[in-house]
Interface confidence: low
């Protein structure tokens, strides 16, 4: 059952070429651009993180004996994944709250590479997607999702971890990026902006969308998240942009209607199981893919990012609820929880469809500048 409230086909970048980002962070950086310090989003910055880093929010991996077969997405330990240290890409804030976890914030000090050196790596996320420069790769087959339609029971944990709202997923949600590229879903979370300020992490030709959903997966080749961190293809994230539409999105409403219960940082509630696939676009065949990193500390690299071409539609009220209900630590609203786009540094974004041909209204005679690498290489 797919949501009817999605654009039938909404090419990313259609009609959005060169649109200025309200935060002034995205100046359509070229692939050669060096990392830049993230501009502090403002007084609503999100302070530290407690539980999981985002997709990133990877789980602290519990001993298997604690709950056999269950992948826990709790606090991801700070891991120093390999990477070439560069100038700071993001700022972070460290403090201690009774444990040894690193705490960080968007737009604060010290820089994220001091929290985790991997944050200064060369192949970081998010990135600006330029359909014209994407390499059409016919080997990228439609994504396969199995077991994503969950029954109401058992209920799922919905948590405000101080830097996002995260839904922990039960075992059994399987996803395949292609033959032999199989993953298990662990958790999903969202990134958003503030009133009148979009907050997606990825951008398309410099255009930032209102919000973005990330569904984080662990490769079946690994039993634990900490084993997969920094390993090519160890983690995979499905990402979709959320846009404003005329109707309420019933699937998202099942989560958004519960946000007030977890408005406080660190709080959580239980929600009935739902159709997780209904939170994603209905077209699993058209997407962009590249290798990047977690977008929050520990910023581990080797993450396979799949960004849907189709967007998901939420009502204006729903987008407002998302951006205006939750609170982070220190009496600050949980808003603008996205990282600045990072340089590609030579990476090629692949497309499962000829994006350069049909997704940008600017190119009358598109030229494919990049060649496709065989999927899975």
């Amino acid at each position: 059952q797919r949501l009817p409230r999605m654009q039938e086909d909404s090419p990313l970048g259609g009609g959005s070429s060169g649109e200025d980002d309200p935060l002034g962070e995205e100046d359509l950086p070229s692939e050669e651009d060096s990392p830049r310090e993230e501009d502090p989003p403002g007084e609503e910055d999100l302070p530290g993180e407690e539980d999981l880093p985002g997709e990133e929010d990877l789980p602290e991996v519990k001993p298997k004996s604690e709950e056999e077969g269950s992948l826990k997405l709790e606090d991801l330990p700070t891991v120093e994944a390999p990477g070439d240290p560069q100038e700071p890409q993001n700022n972070a804030h460290r403090d201690k709250e009774g444990d040894d976890q690193s705490h960080w914030r968007y737009g604060g000090d010290p820089p994220w590479p001091r929290v985790s050196p991997a944050c200064a790596g060369r192949f970081q996320s998010p990135v600006d997607i330029r359909p014209q420069l994407a390499a059409f790769c016919p080997a990228l087959r439609p994504l396969e999702l199995l077991g994503f339609q969950l029954p109401p029971l058992p209920e799922l944990r919905l948590r405000n971890n101080g830097h996002s709202v995260q839904l922990t997923l039960p075992p059994g949600l399987e996803m395949a990026l292609g033959p032999g590229r199989e993953y298990r879903a662990l958790q999903l979370h969202l990134h958003w902006g503030a009133a009148g300020r979009p907050g997606s992490e990825h951008t398309v030709e410099g255009h930032r969308f209102p919000a973005e959903i990330h569904v984080v997966h662990l490769s079946t080749a690994f039993a634990r998240v900490d084993e997969a961190l920094g390993r090519p293809g160890g983690l995979a994230v499905l990402a979709a942009f959320l846009e404003e539409g005329p109707e309420e999105n019933s699937a998202y409403e099942q989560l958004l209607s519960r946000l007030e219960e977890i408005a406080e940082e660190g709080s959580e509630t239980q929600v009935p199981g739902l159709d997780i696939s209904a939170l994603l676009p209905s077209d699993f065949s058209r997407y962009f893919q590249y290798e990047g990193s977690l977008t929050t500390p520990p910023c581990a690299q080797g993450v396979i990012w799949t960004v849907f071409n189709q967007t998901v539609m939420l009502s204006a009220k729903q987008l407002h609820t998302l951006s205006d209900t939750l609170w982070g630590p220190g009496d600050s609203r949980l808003q603008l929880n996205f990282r600045a786009t990072q340089p590609l540094n030579g990476r090629v974004i692949e497309a499962s469809f000829p994006a350069g041909v049909d997704s940008s209204p600017r190119a009358a005679e598109p030229v494919q500048l990049n060649s496709c690498l065989a999927a899975g290489d």
């Epitope: 406080e264 959580e268 509630t269 209900t325």
Partner: antibody
């Protein structure tokens, strides 16, 4: 320093009405859930009701339909309108602020000093 | 409705003693829905523990909270003179039908 000051308590006959106020200083109440709690003489604490930061309200079964919680953000004041009062409503009434902004979680700090409501004929 | 059963109701202890108070919920609740309060005669309650295990600033570290699901505990590691008071747990769940309730209280008296 955040302070909450209740007022409006007193003696009222059964079936009567009373409106309690809780004035806040040192903080903007509009960002916080606020709760009312009462304590009958010599008894324990009893939760009465709560208003969320989005002005949704929930009540204990014992007062549902009789009590109404509201707030006036311009006055930074919380209210408890009590109608159809009964003898068992006699108690010290406390208002309290959610310890953190936004949500409904059960952590309240600080509390007002309380105001005594006596329902008797 | 949810019920919070607190025990013991009364507790006699001496300065320096380790004191443990338990609170049992009639149904599973999230740790973020459980807090503990201290009340002295004629005074308003004071928040001691929130989210089951967290101490607000200004609360002495001899107070600690633990537990999850239905069983929660407040521990005073070394009782001080100023700790003789009544302690209440507050637990519940914030859902479409928000419900919360206090435990019956535990009065800690000087032995």
């Amino acid at each position: 320093e955040v302070q909450l000051l209740e007022s409006g308590g007193g003696l009222v006959q059964p079936g009567g009405s009373l409106r309690l106020s809780c004035a806040a200083s040192g903080i903007d109440l509009s960002n916080y859930a606020m709760t009312w709690v009462r304590q009958a003489p010599g008894k324990g604490l009893e939760w009465v009701g709560i208003i969320s930061s989005n002005d949704k309200t929930w009540y204990a079964d014992s007062v549902k339909g009789r009590f109404t919680i509201s707030r006036d953000n311009s006055k930074n004041t919380l209210y408890l309108q009590m109608n159809s009062l009964r003898a068992e409503d006699t108690a010290v009434y406390y208002c309290a602020k959610a310890a953190m902004p936004g949500g409904l979680k059960n952590a309240f700090d600080p509390w007002g000093q309380g105001t005594l409501v006596t329902v008797s004929s | 409705d949810i019920q919070m059963t607190q025990s013991p109701s009364f507790l006699s202890a001496s300065v320096g003693d380790r004191v443990t108070i338990t609170c049992q919920a009639s149904q599973t609740i999230g740790g973020s829905d459980l807090s503990w309060y201290q009340q002295k005669p004629g005074k308003a309650p004071k928040l001691l523990i929130y989210y089951a295990t967290n101490l607000p600033s200004g609360v002495p570290s001899r107070f600690s909270g633990s537990g999850s699901g239905t069983d929660f505990t407040l521990t005073i590691s070394s009782l001080q003179c100023e700790d003789f008071a009544t302690y209440y747990c507050l637990g519940g769940y914030a859902a479409a039908s928000y419900r919360t309730a206090f435990g019956g209280g535990t009065k800690v008296e000087i032995k």
